[in-house]
């Protein structure tokens, strides 16, 4: 048994679960899903045994291995995968153990505005980047970019002091989850700061 | 240094197939997105695709999803363009290209590796 | 696929000449624009991105505007070193597209 391997996917993609077997005379072999049984394999009469009819399409064993491809990735396919070789000329299963991560697609971020203030000329207000749908595992980086400027900064949150007069600014938020990254329509110091001068309140953006 | 070195180019008959490698150093390769970018001679860019850093997403050009596949080694750093039924249109030099920063624009590029599709 | 058309497809101009080259995207694209050129013989260089901001080591004589689908590659004073072919980058979405290029000679 080796250490657990870790898997990545994308919602909608396809992840292969590797299996090397040393094992010679293999009777079957169990791929179990959270300790729900996945699949059976009997090589000896080629007997593949899918449990549930609803993973039949999504579940298959390229090149004539025993590696599970699984394609049709949802986000519940998450979670723990375990494979058992049983065979008689051993007296312990051979056993692998998986931790498969379904990531999905990320889509433009969002980006709020927080309360805002207007003084000496100075505008000030933080932008708050965000996805829709609450994605999980998903980090944030905002691009300034301007004439004196070009800075990145980790965070969802983007601290922003602008100065009227000053050459204009652009604010960009990237998204990245471990599958794909994104990033939001670009934001304008120059008309963030006119529209937050008239309504003080938080907004979209 | 920052660099990317392609090889595996060169003569192939129309229909055959080619491996293209492209070997990174001076960065960490395995935190990167990667893309393969061709230009036919004389011609523009085009950009054939790009893989993430773990291969769980690999995006392609819909021209050419089905007879290009894209695969990286961390482990080698190295990066990995398979070309199947190969024709004369293909005839290009082959990139391996870095997005500056893991965004979408590329600022290192590998010298390039000539393939040649003809009988 | 967004299609990036390039104008002029060659040009020549003077040194200390103004040059102007414009990429036209067939739908928005925010401003998820680069810039690049490239030498005869050599491989591309990013010059810009996000429409208008250089790469770090890019000569302050290029420069980048636009946003949507109109965007600008100006080079305020050409110099001999700048024959190239140019190239702008789309990649507001996918698959990321290339214009035809701009071929700049030098009269």
């Known amino acids: 048994s080796g250490p657990v391997k870790e898997l990545v996917g994308s919602v909608g993609g396809a992840v292969t679960f590797p299996l090397k077997s040393k094992v010679k005379q293999v009777d079957s072999i169990v791929w179990t899903f959270n300790t729900t049984p996945l699949v059976t394999i009997q090589p000896e009469g080629g007997t593949i045994i899918v449990t549930q009819n609803r993973n039949r399409e999504r579940v298959d064993f390229p090149d004539g291995g025993y590696s599970l491809k699984l394609s049709k990735l949802k986000k519940n396919d998450s979670g723990i995968y375990y494979v058992g070789i049983y065979s008689s000329s051993l007296q312990q299963p051979s056993t692998q153990e998986y931790v498969l991560h379904v990531y999905e697609h990320l889509s433009k971020p969002k980006v709020t505005m927080g309360l805002q203030s207007n003084k000496n000329g100075t505008c000030v207000t933080n932008l708050t980047c965000c996805m829709e749908h609450g994605e999980e595992d998903v980090i944030y980086t905002w691009k300034a970019l301007g004439q004196a400027a070009n800075e990145s900064h980790n965070g969802s949150i983007l601290p922003i002091s602008w100065r009227w007069g000053e050459s204009d600014m652009t604010f960009i938020c990237v998204a990245r989850n471990p599958v794909s990254r994104n990033f939001s329509s670009p934001i304008l110091a120059r008309k963030l700061c006119e529209g937050a001068a008239d309504d003080p309140d938080s907004s979209m953006v | 240094e920052v660099q990317l070195v392609e090889s595996g180019g060169g003569l192939v008959q129309p229909g055959g197939s080619l491996r293209l490698s492209c070997a990174a150093s001076g960065f960490d390769f395995s935190r990167y997105w990667m893309s393969w970018v061709r230009q036919a001679p004389g011609k523009g860019l085009e950009w054939i695709g790009e893989?993430?850093?773990?291969?769980?997403?690999?995006n392609y050009a819909p021209s050419l999803k089905d007879k290009f596949i894209i695969s990286r080694d961390n482990a080698k750093n190295s990066l990995y363009l398979q070309m199947n039924s190969l024709r004369a249109e293909d005839t290009a030099v082959y990139y391996c290209a870095r997005p500056d920063g893991n965004y979408w624009y590329f600022d290192v590029w590998g010298q390039g590796t000539l393939v040649t599709v003809s009988s | 696929d967004i299609q990036m058309t390039q104008s002029p497809s060659s040009l020549s101009a003077s040194v200390g000449d103004r040059v102007t080259i414009t990429c036209k995207a067939s739908?928005?694209?925010?401003?998820?624009v680069a810039w690049y050129q490239q030498k005869p013989g050599k491989v591309p260089k990013l010059l810009i991105y996000?429409?208008?901001t250089r790469h770090t080591g890019v000569p302050d004589r290029f420069s980048g505007s636009g946003s949507g689908t109109d965007f600008t590659l100006t080079i305020s004073s050409l110099q001999p070193e700048d024959v190239a072919t140019y190239y702008c980058q789309q990649y507001s979405s996918y698959p990321y597209t290339f214009g035809q290029g701009t071929k700049l000679e030098i009269k």
């Open positions: 893989i993430n850093p773990d291969s769980s997403t690999i």
């Open positions: 996000w429409a208008s």
């Open positions: 739908q928005d694209v925010g401003i998820a």
